[in-house]
């Protein structure tokens, strides 16, 4: 008789999840020789322990603590790039600008990027059929709690000028409910962070509006200013040209506004 299984609204655990996490860990430690000391089996065991046999709507930051203490690494605190709803461009940028880091350029972020996972209460099985959706099912699911936990600590590490890439094509360019808006903004340390600089990425080719005047950007400025952190904003009208100019800053066309 097949065992009854809770049906959630979100997609199930990414196929070959354990193998993927372990392989990513090994790859990361090979790419970053300073991380050679990391024991990837211990990392996987700690990751697995956070959600296996636990109700996927009852996950806490506490569950991830054994994982959170692993993989200590050095990220220059003045080279942190946050992003919201524009991950691909942010990652393309740090692939070119190698001295800047998104959360997904760190070990824990790299392990979990684009993956989904959850378990089931009282069984050691991974649920490959469905996992809770943040809106439709519950917010305390394994994936959401993981990103909240690592995002908080990443933001706490930032100093000097912190950059954030925002998607100018969305109705809410700054969304208070995003991980950036609900976690990272509130965990920047005012005694260390001097300025938050927003880069608003334009979508349309002919879009010449100043999206830094958008009401949601003004809302972000207000939140940041109240935390005694300065705020600045730049329009990136041509993201393709922007990336090209990061690659080749000497190019004559890169002196004009991008």
């Amino acid at each position: 008789v097949p065992r009854w299984r809770q049906q959630w609204s979100g997609p199930g655990t990414t196929k070959r999840f354990p193998e993927t996490v372990l392989a990513r860990c090994v790859k990361y430690t090979e790419i970053h020789p300073e991380m050679r000391h990391v024991d990837c089996q211990s990392v996987w065991d700690a990751f697995k322990g956070a959600f296996i046999s636990k109700h996927p709507c009852n996950i806490t930051e506490e569950d991830y603590q054994p994982l959170m203490k692993l993989g200590t690494q050095t990220v220059p605190c003045n080279k942190i790039l946050l992003w919201s709803r524009i991950k691909d461009l942010a990652h393309q940028f740090t692939q070119v600008q190698r001295d800047m880091f998104t959360l997904e350029d760190t070990l824990l972020g790299y392990l979990a990027d684009d993956l989904t996972w959850c378990g089931e209460f009282n069984t050691s099985k991974i649920n490959y059929q469905s996992c809770p959706d943040w809106r439709k099912d519950c917010s305390n699911n394994p994936v959401s709690v993981f990103w909240k936990t690592v995002s908080r600590r990443f933001a706490e590490a930032a100093c000097d000028v912190v950059h954030v890439m925002l998607n100018g094509s969305r109705s809410k360019i700054f969304d208070k409910n995003s991980t950036f808006g609900s976690v990272e903004v509130h965990n920047l340390q005012p005694e260390k962070v001097q300025t938050l600089e927003a880069w608003v990425i334009h979508g349309g080719r002919e879009d010449s509006r100043d999206l830094c005047q958008d009401p949601t950007i003004k809302e972000l400025e207000s939140i940041i200013s109240k935390r005694n952190i300065q705020f600045s904003c730049k329009n990136i009208y041509r993201p393709d040209k922007f990336l090209q100019c990061v690659k080749n800053p000497e190019d004559s066309s890169c002196t004009s506004e991008i």
């Epitope: 506490e62 959170m68 203490k69 200590t72 690494q73 605190c77 908080r152 600590r153 590490a157």
Partner: antibody
């Protein structure tokens, strides 16, 4: 603002014990190792041990096993160090310090220190 | 266990002078995990530099760090009065941790 507030100076007799506290604020206490460091007058820094409040994991410098006992109370965001069988060589300033996860394990915030004097 | 030896133990420099102090490890250390602290009398140490060359928040840009393997250094391009202090190097490792013996920098 991140702060580590340590308890006040202690004067103790040889053979006695003391419990020092370090109250953390301004960050998520659970997700950072808390380190303890000893400094004798006019001397350098000596590592005692560390505790990870998130899961209670503890690691000690072999030299201080049996001398120092580390604990943490997550509900009050406070780390403790119990020093037993005090002797004159335990007279020192003891610091708690937070290990910065993205700072390569460097100690990015320090308490003001607690002075322990052992004297008969 | 890796030991860190700092040299010189004590040094003095005139205002405006370039200052370099070294930290030598008994065996190779990853540059990502070699850190420096500044301590002044009566105060706790302060994180000064992390991962060999990254300045901690608020540290003046006249400070720089370099090195790899077993040899690391902290340099002040132009000594200022407020730089007089003791500097400790430190190697991160889960256990045991090690600090160097310190270099005391005085004003000549």
């Amino acid at each position: 603002q991140v702060q580590l507030q340590q308890s006040g100076a202690e004067l103790a007799r040889p053979g006695a014990s003391v419990k020092l506290s370090c109250k953390a604020s301004g960050y998520t206490f659970n997700t950072y190792w808390m380190q303890w460091v000893k400094q004798r007058p006019g001397q350098g820094l000596e590592w005692i041990g560390a505790i990870y409040p998130g899961d209670g994991d503890i690691t000690y410098n072999q030299k201080f096993k049996g001398k120092a006992t580390l604990t943490a109370d997550k509900s009050s965001n406070t780390a403790y160090m119990h020093l037993s069988s005090l002797a004159s060589e335990d007279s020192a300033v003891y610091y708690c310090a937070r290990e910065g996860y993205y700072y390569g394990g460097a100690l990015d915030y320090w308490g003001q220190g607690t002075s322990v004097t052992v004297s008969s | 266990q890796i030991f860190l030896t700092q040299s010189p133990a004590i040094m003095s420099a005139s205002l405006g002078e370039r200052v370099t102090m070294t930290c030598t490890a008994s065996s190779s250390v990853s540059s990502s995990y070699l850190h420096w602290y500044q301590q002044k009398p009566g105060s706790p140490p302060k994180l000064w530099m992390y991962g060999t060359s990254n300045l901690a928040s608020g540290v003046p840009p006249r400070f720089s760090g370099s090195g790899s393997g077993t040899s690391y250094s902290l340099t002040i391009s132009s000594m200022e009065a407020e730089d007089a202090a003791t500097y400790y190097c430190h190697r991160y490792h889960r256990s045991p941790w090690t600090f160097g013996g310190g270099t005391k920098l005085e004003i000549k």
